[in-house]
Interface confidence: low
Amino acid sequence: SEVEYRAEVGQNAYLPCFYTPAAPGNLVPVCWGKGACPVFECGNVVLRTDERDVNYWTSRYWLNGDFRKGDVSLTIENVTLADSGIYCCRIQIPGIMNDEKFNLKLVIKPAKVTPAPTRQRDFTAAFPRMLTTRGHGPAETQTLGSLPDINLTQISTLANELRDSRLANDLRDSGATIRIG
């Protein structure tokens, strides 16, 4: 059965997933997808890393930790009830059927109190390469290398004020962790 994690509407959700690189900087590709882990790859990919960089991510989904050390925990920004469900963290270890798969269940609870509406922060000043998306829907993605000359979608990421590092630390020990090598 899946490990269950909870968050309230409007909060950031944190889904822990870790591996230990065989050697420092010797990274393994990882994908995160919405839905249980299929036989291969990830379904409905929301974020992907390769041996050097995060090379694909979608709006509201980002890596908060140091993925160069194997912390590939997923942060989902400003969750809604629609974000509930199973998420797959797949550590794509080279070799046939070597992948490590972790299914994590996210349960979103209604907010205890409805916060007063606030003006959306514009992240341009602090994170100008990753801007807040103005539009909505499936077009809110960024991908590098998979399509020629696509427009980079402006998304928010790595925002200090959106971090909940205490939650991250609390969940680190109970997260999915494997050792490689």
Epitope: R52, W57, D66, R129, T157
Partner: antibody, heavy 121, light 107 residues
């Protein structure tokens, strides 16, 4: 083998213009960020501008904003720095360097050899 | 802009010495700090990325560490080819900013 080669530097009068080129080989600039960094004689390193060629998103240092324009041609795997209204304080060796889109990991892992820009009357 | 305050600005050391260079960020930069080595007339070379990762091909005598907003580059046993200028850099926010540099000279 990854390589970055700058060209286009030279002597120019104050108020003049130059266009620097950064020709990349061994990798696709569309998957990276290209940065320009300069170094005045005997001084430290100063970041100037960057571009995400796959989409054209650009950023500039305040000191060059509205005077310099960074661009890229992915078909030629080349980035450019158009420098207008040049001032004496723009005199420096200009380097292009390769970086990464995911900001947390955007260290500059390959650099060109540099091209010298001298602004003097 | 985030200031990277690097110290010392220069130091004299002998071959075999342990050398430590520090950089303090004016605000949180997480682990988004790199260290570069530059020799006269040459382009900088990446040594350490993400505060503590040794870049490919860099000798293991180089190491990096982080404590809050303080970052350290250590050369465990200085070699003749290590005499150069070293720069730290934060790449957490725009503009990326460099420290002033530390020149490591022969004693």
């Amino acid at each position: 083998e990854v390589q970055l080669v700058e060209s286009g530097g030279g002597l120019v009068q104050p108020g003049g213009s130059l266009r620097l080129s950064c020709a990349a080989s061994g990798f696709n600039i569309g998957k990276h960020v290209i940065h320009w960094v300069r170094q005045a004689p005997g001084k430290g390193l100063e970041w100037v501008a960057d571009i995400v060629p796959n989409g054209g998103y650009t950023e500039y240092a305040d000191s060059v904003k509205d005077r310099f324009t960074i661009s890229a041609d992915t078909s030629k795997n080349t980035a450019y720095l158009q420098m207008n209204s040049l001032r004496a304080e723009d005199t420096a060796v200009y380097y292009c360097a390769r970086g990464y889109v995911y900001r947390m990991w955007d260290s500059f892992d390959y650099w060109g050899q540099g091209t010298l820009v001298t602004v003097s009357s | 802009d985030i200031q990277m305050t690097q110290s010392p600005s220069s130091l004299s050391a002998s071959v075999g010495d342990r050398v430590t260079i520090t950089c303090r960020a004016s605000q949180d930069v997480n682990t988004a700090v790199a260290w570069y080595q530059q020799k006269p007339g040459k382009a900088p070379k990446l040594l350490i990325y993400s505060a503590s990762f040794l870049y490919s091909g860099v000798p293991s005598r180089f190491s990096g560490s982080r404590s809050g907003t303080d970052f350290t580059l250590t050369i465990s046993s200085l070699q003749p080819e290590d005499f150069a200028t070293y720069y730290c850099q934060q790449h957490y926010t725009t503009p990326p900013t460099f420290g002033q540099g530390t020149k490591v000279e022969i004693k």
